[in-house]
């Protein structure tokens, strides 16, 4: 083993290095000292380090480590953050277009149902957006509310437009009849299935991306333990105390230290791998009724079909509802 | 399979959109993201090595620092001596992860479970048991595009294509002007929505 080079007789070099870390402080001894108070850079002989310097080195080492960790994750973090934003915006655009398609369908095919239909369609797609973003809304409730709200308007405007004003206040009865008589056939059920499946998958996809960001942020801002700080100090800075300014840590030694410092973080690895593979599996399944774009952009057509179904059965329905809702009375201002 | 009568269009103008050779759909963007994410699959296990390679480490020098002294790069002491009489590395590892790391691991476990539950087997088609009422739902086969809805003879496919174009080529405005008679509705063989969302590379 080569003999250690003689320490800087005046600690001058160490001082100029340390000044860069802590300008203006007189913590560096003029000449090498025994360093019996040192706790990290334990000297084999005289040393150019003091206890205060050691503390500063520890702080710097931990800061360096945090910066290295942040630069390590920068590309990954950017990838997920940007994609999460892009997909969220894309999903919002899909919802907006789906709403516009549906409104256009009402406007062009059933003008007498607007503006009420616009209002219900607007509310429905508001809930769709809120659901995707994580709101605790039930998809079945949204779909039921859409058809419950639409049917009274369809009945009074399309099926029975000649109703006298006195008979117009039968919404309660018509809403009830909507489900009891299955006036839209199985279309509401079809829409529920398609919408709930596609939105669930979309929502979990966005949740997963946002959790990915949270994982990176968590490990990005980890505060390293004192023990780790000491190990890093010994690796990066203790050589300075002996005047060895240009010497670098051994590669194997660095790996051992890093594994020690990152033992906790590395435990994420197993779950991170599983996260990416599970996300891949989800993405591979996002098609047909598990693809919200496909489902929502086709909703206008399914709703159109459902109204046509009502119209096809209008004769039978009008008779049944006429009997069922004959006793509905007008609401009074009390 | 959505039937659309001719009188759907108040405005008979047909919107012509230039064919996009490599249209970027939402699903293609999702797959692209997954491919990029997969290149980071070993991110956490590779972190210690990554940080060593991005901090000053003796690569070409003959001598290196092992925490206590200057040693030859390939000697036994290069990795071992620096740890002696210092901190018990094994103990440091045994302490377990920080509470915040444990918390994030729990969240990952939870989302992984959700993702697995939600992941659908390939080739699954629209549930057939919805047809109990006997309305004409159109028999949706194993086509590339799911057919949606149902009655009638004029079939259009709803293609999955939210395209990321350089410009917003087409945007419906019922939203802002319910009374606008210049309203167009999807027609012909596909429904496309266009928007510029910028590229993520």
């Amino acid at each position: 083993q080569p003999p250690p080079p003689p320490p800087d007789a005046t600690c001058h070099q160490v001082r100029s290095f340390f000044q860069r870390l802590q300008p203006g402080l007189k913590w560096v001894p003029e000449t090498p000292v025994p360093g019996s108070d040192l706790q990290v850079c334990l000297p084999k002989g005289p040393t150019c380090c003091s206890r205060k310097m050691e503390e500063k080195y520890q702080l710097t080492a931990r800061l360096n480590m945090e910066q290295l960790l942040q630069s390590a994750s920068m590309e990954l973090k950017f990838l997920i953050i940007q994609n999460a934003a892009v997909f969220q915006e894309a999903f919002e655009i899909v919802v907006r277009h789906a709403k516009n398609y549906t409104n256009a369908m009402f406007k062009n095919n059933y003008p007498s149902l607007t503006p009420q239909a616009f209002e219900f369609v607007g509310e429905f797609f508001t809930d769709v957006s809120l659901y995707i973003l994580g709101s605790d809304i039930n998809v079945d409730d949204m779909v039921n509310e859409l058809f419950d709200s639409l049917f009274p308007v369809i009945y009074t405007q399309l099926m029975n437009p000649g109703l006298p004003d006195s008979a117009l206040d039968i919404n309660e009865c018509l809403r009830g009849a909507r489900r009891d008589l299955k006036v839209f056939g199985n279309f509401p059920k079809l829409i529920m299935t398609q919408v709930s499946k596609s939105l669930q998958v979309t929502r979990i996809f966005l949740q997963a991306l946002n959790l990915g960001i949270e994982v990176i942020n968590t490990t990005d801002h980890l505060k390293f333990s004192k023990d780790c700080g000491r190990m890093l100090t010994r690796m990066w800075y203790c050589s300075y105390c002996q005047g060895l300014m240009m010497v670098k840590p051994c590669g194997g030694y660095c790996n051992v230290v890093m594994q020690g410092c990152m033992a906790g973080v590395v435990e994420i690895d197993k779950y991170w791998r599983e996260y990416i593979l599970s996300l891949e599996e989800l993405v591979n399944g996002m098609y047909r009724i598990y693809d919200m774009e496909n489902v929502l952009l086709g909703l206008f057509s399914t709703i159109h079909d459902s109204i046509q179904y009502v119209q096809k059965n209008a004769g039978k329905l009008t008779t049944t509802i006429g009997k069922l809702c004959a006793h509905s009375q007008q609401r009074q201002y009390r | 399979s959505a039937y659309y009568p001719e009188d759907l269009f108040i405005d008979k103008k047909v919107l012509k959109v230039a064919h996009v050779e490599h249209e970027e759909t939402l699903s293609s963007r999702r797959r692209e993201l997954i491919q990029k994410l997969k290149s980071f699959i070993s991110f956490y296990s590779a972190l210690p090595g990554y940080i060593c390679s991005h901090s000053p480490v003796a690569e070409n020098d003959t001598l290196c620092w092992n925490g206590q002294e200057l040693v030859e790069r390939y000697s036994q002491k290069a990795a071992r001596n620096g740890m002696k009489n210092q901190f018990n590395l094994h103990e440091l590892k045994m302490k377990g992860p920080e509470p915040v790391v444990s918390q994030i691991i729990d969240k990952l476990k939870h989302i992984n479970q959700l993702l697995r539950t939600m992941s659908m087997p390939k080739g699954r088609v629209l549930d057939k048991n919805l047809d109990e009422e006997g309305f004409e739902s159109g028999d949706c086969g194993d086509d590339e595009d799911e057919c949606i809805g149902g009655s009638g003879d004029g079939m259009i496919k709803v293609k999955n294509q939210l395209r990321f174009l350089a410009e917003l080529a087409y945007d419906l405005d019922v939203d802002d002007a319910p009374g606008n008679s210049q309203q167009a509705t999807p027609k012909d063989n596909e429904i496309s929505t266009f928007h510029n969302l910028g590229n993520v590379h």
């Epitope: 508001t126 809930d127 039921n144 | -």
Partner: antibody, heavy 120, light 112 residues
């Protein structure tokens, strides 16, 4: 005609649970949600929760652990239950039908109210 | 939670007068979908509240046209063009833009 009729005890002890039944007529519980609101001199009107036509429920986060709303569609009845009532839960409790769109709606018809005093 | 503040607490009027009640919310009631979910109720003495106005300005079925609502964002007003005896009672504003729904403290409309 739309009506909501409430029934329940006026006096409740803290050890018991507070239960009120709302019986509706003129509409079906399979197509309308029913909300619960209370009114006290100290707190004014306070929204407690709702049961939707599907049977799904939403509660005020402050009271979620103590509240339960259930219903029987065939009997047109909605059941409100609050566990471990305290003195400051004394109030007039109202059920009301949801008008408008789900949680962005309003109460278009109200029950007559049930005055509840919690006292040991 | 969104705090709803009503002014005045008490409003003495003569029959036939115009009355105006103000309601202010601690945050905007304009929903991301463009709608504003602000409603007005009237509670007559010893009775349950009744819905008067929903979504800022829509009169509920059977409500006389002397009642009108207006406002936007965080400031709203209920106006009664000519007060009648049956209009006396406590008026409440309420919002359903944000969960939980919240109510104002009430404004008592009474005879001078």
């Amino acid at each position: 005609q739309v009506q909501l009729k409430q029934s329940g005890p006026g006096l409740v002890q803290p050890s018991q649970s507070l239960s009120i039944t709302c019986t509706v007529s003129g509409f079906s519980l399979t197509s309308y949600g029913v909300h619960w609101v209370r009114q006290s001199p100290g707190k004014g009107l306070e929204w407690l929760g709702v049961i939707w036509s599907s049977g799904n429920t939403d509660y005020n986060a402050v009271l979620i652990s103590r509240l339960s709303i259930k219903k029987d569609d065939s009997k047109s009845q909605v059941f409100f239950k609050m566990n471990s009532p305290q003195v400051d839960d004394s109030a007039i409790y109202y059920c009301g039908r949801n008008g408008g769109w789900l949680l962005r709606g309003f109460m278009d018809f109200w029950g007559q109210g049930t005055s509840v005093t919690v006292s040991s | 939670d969104v705090v709803m503040t009503q002014t005045p607490l008490s409003l003495p009027v003569s029959l036939g007068d115009q009355a105006s009640i103000s309601c202010r919310s601690s945050q905007s009631l304009l929903h991301s979908n463009g709608n504003t979910y602000l409603h007005w109720y009237l509670q007559r003495s010893g009775q349950s509240p009744n819905l008067l106005i929903y979504k800022v300005s829509n009169r509920f079925s059977g409500v006389p046209d002397r009642f009108s609502g207006g406002g936007s964002g965080t400031d709203f007003t209920l106006k009664i063009s000519r007060v009648e005896a049956e209009d006396l009672g406590i008026y409440f504003c309420s919002q359903s833009t944000h969960v939980p729904w919240t109510f104002g403290g009430g404004t008592k409309l009474e005879i001078k």
